[in-house]
């Protein structure tokens, strides 16, 4: 006869491990008992359980309520046992010793491998700002047994580097993603992908990139010269910029206070019916937490009654 078993039994943490040991013998042979032992390089061989054909399953107190026979129907030649709720400390070598009649004793050893699936965590790097050099965008750490694989999935151009730390029963892997921040990266997803034999599918954690920037400011509204004549209504100046975080706008007049009746509404400066009093240099000040920009324009309101004056519109930033 011979024993049918496995060299390696692999189970995920918390699952039940079936330790197989089946005696394949002649029809007239019988199994008297199957003794299971844990083989420890330091502590030697320690009995785990004994499965006796007459006296039933005996379990070592250290494994009480954790070792069982597989559910019926059971073959009398099957000495397999179930180790409930596998933990990392269960990982190691096991031995089954089968006492048969009349063939004698047979033994086999197997290794129990307990997979510990990782629980990854993603940590964003310092705030990203346009104009910085190569900067840490995010790091992703996963610890498991065996060591997990940590990679990045993104359309963003960057570099990734990994390092691992080995512990007695697991390994922690940290991968960092570095990039040169630009405004085009704003809102782009950066996904950490963790692979491991204990996971049915990859674990993914997505971080949305935020890159702080502030665009140059410019003013629109002076394109149509006919709008800037005495008596005209609805004249506006609009300050154009964009940024992250979204910028705030402030309007001032360089050569004095804003004329009465001029209304500031965010990025837009609205004028009442125009008079020559509205002529002057107007400054749009754009700012966010990162930076500030200015753009100024010179407005000259033409009086159609004064043919000596031409409309002179000058814009400068």
């Amino acid at each position: 006869g011979e024993l049918e078993t496995s060299d390696v039994v692999t189970v995920v943490l918390g699952q039940d491990a079936k330790l197989p040991c089946f005696y394949r013998g002649d029809p007239d042979e019988q199994v008297g008992q199957v003794a299971w032992a844990r083989v420890d390089p330091n502590e030697g061989i320690r009995e785990l359980a004994l499965l006796h054909s007459k006296y039933g399953l005996h379990v070592n107190p250290a494994y009480e309520d954790r070792v069982e026979q597989p559910p019926p129907p059971r073959d009398p030649l099957d000495g397999s046992v179930l180790l409930r709720n596998a933990v990392q400390a269960d990982e190691g070598e096991y031995e089954c010793r089968v006492s048969t009649f009349p063939a004698g004793s047979f033994q086999a050893r197997m290794r129990l491998r307990v997979l510990v699936p990782p629980l990854p965590s993603l940590n964003p790097g310092p705030p990203l700002e346009e104009g910085q050099g190569l900067t840490l965008a995010a790091s992703c750490t996963a610890e498991g047994s065996p060591a997990p694989s940590v990679t990045w999935d993104t359309e963003v151009k960057g570099t990734q580097s990994s390092r691992s730390f080995t512990h007695p029963r697991s390994a922690a892997v940290t991968s960092e993603f570095h990039l040169v921040p630009s405004r085009s990266m704003n809102g782009q997803p950066l996904t950490c992908v963790v692979s491991h034999p204990g996971l049915l599918q990859d674990r993914r954690i997505t971080h949305t990139l935020q890159v702080a920037f502030l665009a140059e400011a410019s003013v629109r509204g002076l394109e149509d010269q006919n709008l800037w004549q005495v008596g005209r209504e609805g004249a506006t100046l609009k300050c154009l910029s964009e940024g992250q975080p979204p910028p705030k706008y402030n309007w001032t007049r360089l050569d004095g206070p804003l004329p009465s009746g001029v209304r500031v509404k965010g990025d837009t400066l609205g004028f009442p019916p125009l008079t020559t009093e509205h002529s002057g240099v107007y400054v749009c000040h754009v700012s966010n937490e990162l930076s500030s920009r200015d753009s100024q324009v010179t407005v000259e309101v033409l009086d159609p009654e004064d043919p000596g004056k031409q409309v002179d519109l000058v814009s400068a930033s």
């Epitope: 008297g32 008992q33 003794a35 032992a37 320690r46 009995e47 785990l48 359980a49 004994l50 006796h52 007459k54 006296y55 005996h58 379990v59 070592n60 107190p61 009480e64 006492s99 009649f101």
Partner: nanobody
Framework: EVQLVESGGGLVQAGGFLRLSCAAS????????MGWYRQAPGKQRELVAG???????RLADSVKGRFTISRDNAKNTVYLQMNSLKPEDTAVYYC???????????WGQGTQVTVSS
């Protein structure tokens, strides 16, 4: 041959306790399986508890949480601690020892346990 001598039986009220001892004439460390069967009047003999040379144990479902089996290798003795005894535990308790796997077990002479309500 292994001689087994039991002691510790007696009459006890329900809820009480007894400790049975089974002294073997040779090292219990070398005995494959030792333990206790019981037989109540008019009933079949049933396995109550067992302990292996490697220290693994078995208790019948009917006594789990109430009985414990242990052994003292130095004294070549196996013990059955019986707590929270019930009238249905009344029986003759027999110590057994299977010296080598597959061999017929050796038996003690039996000790009477009576639990009164």
């Amino acid at each position: 041959e292994v001689q087994l001598v039991e002691s510790g039986g007696g009459l006890v009220q329900a809820g009480g306790f007894l400790r049975l001892s089974c002294a073997a004439s040779r090292s219990v460390f070398r005995i494959n399986v030792m333990g206790w069967y019981r037989q109540a009047p008019g009933k079949q003999r049933e396995l109550v508890a067992g302990i292996t040379s490697g220290g693994s144990r078995r208790l019948a479902d009917s006594v789990k949480g109430r009985f414990t089996i242990s052994r003292d290798n130095a004294k070549n003795t196996v013990y059955l601690q019986m707590n929270s005894l019930k009238p249905e535990d009344t029986a003759v308790y027999y110590c057994f020892a299977e010296a080598v796997v597959g061999d017929e077990p050796y038996w003690g002479q039996g000790t009477q346990v009576t639990v009164s309500s």
